[in-house]
Amino acid sequence: MMTGTIETTGNISAEKGGSIILQCHLSSTTAQVTQVNWEQQDQLLAICNADLGWHISPSFKDRVAPGPGLGLTLQSLTVNDTGEYFCIYHTYPDGTYTGRIFLEVLESSVAEHGARFQIP
């Protein structure tokens, strides 16, 4: 029985050229997190593995930094970075939990953070 929930930064926006932190948090479960994958639509951005550390996909090495914690920092944002991002928590014994974040990269300075929300 999967009892955990993932809290994410929800819908967020940021300015072109700036940076943003994508953050997820798994709660309400005692399951052991073995790996967290960060994906943008169907592209793997980074992996944080409990036994190995961080692996950043080669095509994102210049613009992606690990952390804080199990989060991910995206730098030098472009309009093309607009879209859905997923944190995928692989846990034992529960299985997989997925959180969704929507990022909008804006040309102007009207970037504003959305509210946090939970995905069961």
Epitope: N49, A50, D51, L52, G53, W54, H55, I56, P66
Partner: antibody, heavy 119, light 107 residues
Framework: QVQLVESGGGVVQPGRSLRLSCAAS????????MHWVRQAPGKGLEWVAV????????YYADSVEGRFTISRDNSKNTLYLQMNSLRAEDTALYYC????????????WGQGTMVTVSS | DIQLTQSPSSVSASVGDRVTITCRAS??????LAWYQQKPGKAPKLLIY???SLQSGVPSRFSGSGSGTDFTLTISSLQPEDFATYYC?????????FGGGTKVEIK
């Protein structure tokens, strides 16, 4: 007791291939990540590759990516390193090693097997 | 990749001396640093993991400290069996990387 024993090293010409083996005993091999680390004569340690417990999660050092392949046979408690397109700079003592789970330190090492790439 | 710079590359010391070896990472690696001891013709031996946790069976005269980019291995009172080469290793990022080593020699 926990033991790792490497084999398969030898002298090989540049461009040729070699497969190293590492026989494990004394622990639950099928539950452990496994690593290869090498040491050129008179030089320091260089991490080479790692493989997940179930054979997934394979990662390599940039210096061997695309030439070396790490694999394992959990039914035989054996780790492998297939080395293709060997170069003189691959000459080294190759160690297999077991990590402390979730601590990211290598606590059990084999005695090493020597690979010499020379024409 | 993360570069680890160890200093000094070699140190001459006497039995009973306090010896300190430093390891500096090119980027922050939190506390994901291990220390190893290697004697000639032997495989490395894990001393410290997680920057400061002593591996089981390792004498308490060995200690590790630091986080972020700067780390230290200290041998509080050097013993004859401690003359060896010491390596740091980071495990925050793949690929894992090792420092160049510090040789502790008899003065």
């Amino acid at each position: 007791q926990v033991q790792l024993v490497e084999s398969g090293g030898g002298v090989v010409q540049p461009g040729r291939s070699l497969r190293l083996s590492c026989a494990a005993s004394g622990f639950t091999f099928s539950s452990s990540y496994m690593h290869w680390v090498r040491q050129a004569p008179g030089k320091g340690l260089e991490w080479v590759a790692v493989i997940g417990a179930d054979g997934s999660n394979k990662y390599y050092a940039d210096s061997v990516e695309g030439r070396f392949t790490i694999s394992r046979d959990n039914s035989k408690n054996t780790l492998y390193l297939q080395m293709n397109s060997l170069r003189a700079e691959d000459t080294a003592l190759y160690y297999c090693a077991k990590p402390v789970p979730r601590r990211r330190g290598l606590d059990v090492w084999g005695q090493g097997t020597m690979v010499t790439v020379s024409s | 990749d993360i570069q680890l710079t160890q200093s000094p590359s070699s140190v001459s010391a006497s039995v009973g001396d306090r010896v300190t070896i430093t390891c500096r990472a090119s980027q922050g690696i939190s506390s994901w640093l291990a220390w190893y001891q290697q004697k000639p013709g032997k495989a490395p031996k894990l001393l410290i993991y997680g920057a400061s946790s002593l591996q089981s069976g390792v004498p308490s005269r060995f200690s590790g400290s630091g986080s972020g980019t700067d780390f230290t291995l200290t041998i509080s009172s050097l013993q004859p069996e401690d003359f060896a080469t010491y390596y740091c290793q980071q495990a925050f990022y793949l690929p894992w990387t090792f420092g160049g080593g510090t040789k502790v020699e008899i003065k």
